[in-house]
């Protein structure tokens, strides 16, 4: 089992992830692990020499880069917020701010926009991943209502008047709650103080 550097006539290396072909010497050399970069290139007699990325820089993959990438903050102007910091082994992790969705994607999200409001009587369909797409508004299911224009309001169950010792005055709709009233109408003024048996 040859250890880098070793000769390669067919320009391929056994471990594509951790080795690379160096055409000048026609050899396979070690890549540098995540969090490091090439500080000295390999030769026929010496393998790649790696060094740790300096503060505020990173390399995410096994590489033969002679520099590390500069850490960049998430851009709040583009509606992004940070969920995890940059380390020597990974770039800053960003996501759309609450109430926004990803509107432009180039390997990662580059621009977020405000989620559309869902009108009364509807709610946003729940997605597997928050911030991945704009709202798709769906009607409230039977027995539920939602009475605002909002990107995030959820349909709520109609009030059950009987649970509060009341009776229904007007039924609930998709846009409004049930209206309840007291089952005992107030006594007429002339009968107040009189007890009906």
């Amino acid at each position: 089992q040859a250890v880098p550097p070793y000769a390669s006539e067919n320009q391929t290396c056994r471990d594509q992830e951790k080795e690379y072909y160096e055409p000048q010497h026609r050899i396979c050399c070690s890549r540098c692990p995540p969090g490091t970069y090439v500080s000295a290139k390999c030769s026929r007699i010496r393998d790649t020499v790696c060094a740790t990325c300096a503060e505020n820089s990173y390399n995410e993959h096994w590489n033969y880069l002679t520099i590390c990438q500069l850490c960049r903050p998430c851009d709040p102007v583009m509606g992004l917020e940070e969920i995890a910091p940059c380390t020597s082994k990974r770039k800053t992790q960003c996501r759309c701010q609450p109430g926004m969705f990803c509107a432009a994607w180039a390997l990662e999200c580059t621009h977020c926009e405000l989620l559309s409001d869902c009108p009364p009587g509807t709610e946003a369909e729940l997605k597997d991943e928050v911030g991945k797409g704009n709202n798709h508004c769906v009607p409230c299911k039977a027995g539920h209502f939602q009475n605002t224009s909002s990107p995030s309001a959820r349909c709520q169950p109609h009030t059950r008047c009987e649970n509060q010792g009341l009776v229904e005055a007007a039924p609930g709709t998709a846009q409004s709650d049930t209206t309840c009233k007291n089952p005992l109408e107030p006594l007429p003024p002339e009968m107040s103080g009189t007890m009906l048996m």
Partner: antibody, heavy 116, light 107 residues
Framework: QVQLVQSGAEVKKPGSSVKVSCKAS????????LHWVRQAPGQCLEWMGW????????QYNEKFKGRVTITADKSTSTAYMELSSLRSEDTAVYYC?????????WGQGTTVTVSS | DIQMTQSPSSLSASVGDRVTITCKAS??????VAWYQQKPGKAPKLLIS???YRYSGVPSRFSGSGSGTDFTLTISSLQPEDFATYFC?????????FGCGTKVEIK
């Protein structure tokens, strides 16, 4: 060498606000995140939030959202942490710290006492 | 939020002893864990980052290990200046969280 020098101890009344400063030197102020961490007596260290002075954007721990404001003045390389609606539980040592795979650099700490 | 559960909360040891402190994360944090030493009235000092990398100037008797959810700080031979409180911290995701500390006292 990197230095973070914080303002002096403060005694505050409940309901009031406190503003602690952290003056940075020995590095490019605008390219590193500055965080605020507090340590109440007998309690765990608690991360409050950070500011990136390059774009003066701050992000906060949900626990303190609405009560904490972190700002930075690029001209003086100084970061500030203001905590409002103070209560007795906010009595703590407040630290600023510069991050990179942990916190390699810390200020000396500012003791804030909240007492009526 | 990710909880960092540190144990023991305190321990008594003698100079020359081998001391081990553990920290358990409530979810996977990769190797994004740091260890600190703190003495009374002072700010914490970074000892270890990326779970096992000794910070510059930290004596070789301090070592860190672990990944995922289980992490360990080991002091191979305790010195008089090592009596202090030690904290772990995850910096994998916000909000950053700390263990509540292990106080190393003289037996």
């Amino acid at each position: 060498q990197v230095q973070l020098v914080q303002s002096g101890a403060e005694v505050k009344k409940p309901g009031s606000s406190v503003k602690v400063s952290c003056k940075a030197s020995g590095y490019t102020f605008t390219t590193y995140y500055l965080h605020w961490v507090r340590q109440a007596p007998g309690q765990c260290l608690e991360w409050m939030g950070w500011i990136y002075p390059g774009n003066v954007h701050a992000q906060y721990n949900e626990k303190f959202k609405g009560r904490v404001t972190i700002t930075a003045d690029k001209s003086t390389s100084t970061a500030y942490m203001e905590l409002s609606s103070l209560r007795s539980e906010d009595t703590a040592v407040y630290y600023c710290a510069r991050s990179w795979e942990g916190f390699p650099y810390w200020g000396q700490g500012t003791t804030v006492t909240v007492s009526s | 939020d990710i909880q960092m559960t540190q144990s023991p909360s305190s321990l008594s040891a003698s100079v020359g002893d081998r001391v081990t402190i553990t920290c358990k994360a409530s979810q996977n944090v990769g190797i994004n864990v740091a260890w600190y030493q703190q003495k009374p009235g002072k700010a914490p000092k970074l000892l270890i980052s990326s779970a096992s990398y000794r910070y510059s100037g930290v004596p070789s008797r301090f070592s860190g290990s672990g990944s995922g959810t289980d992490f360990t700080l080991t002091i191979s031979s305790l010195q008089p200046e090592d009596f202090a409180t030690y904290f772990c911290q995850q910096y994998d995701t916000y909000p950053f969280t700390f263990g509540c500390g292990t106080k190393v006292e003289i037996k």
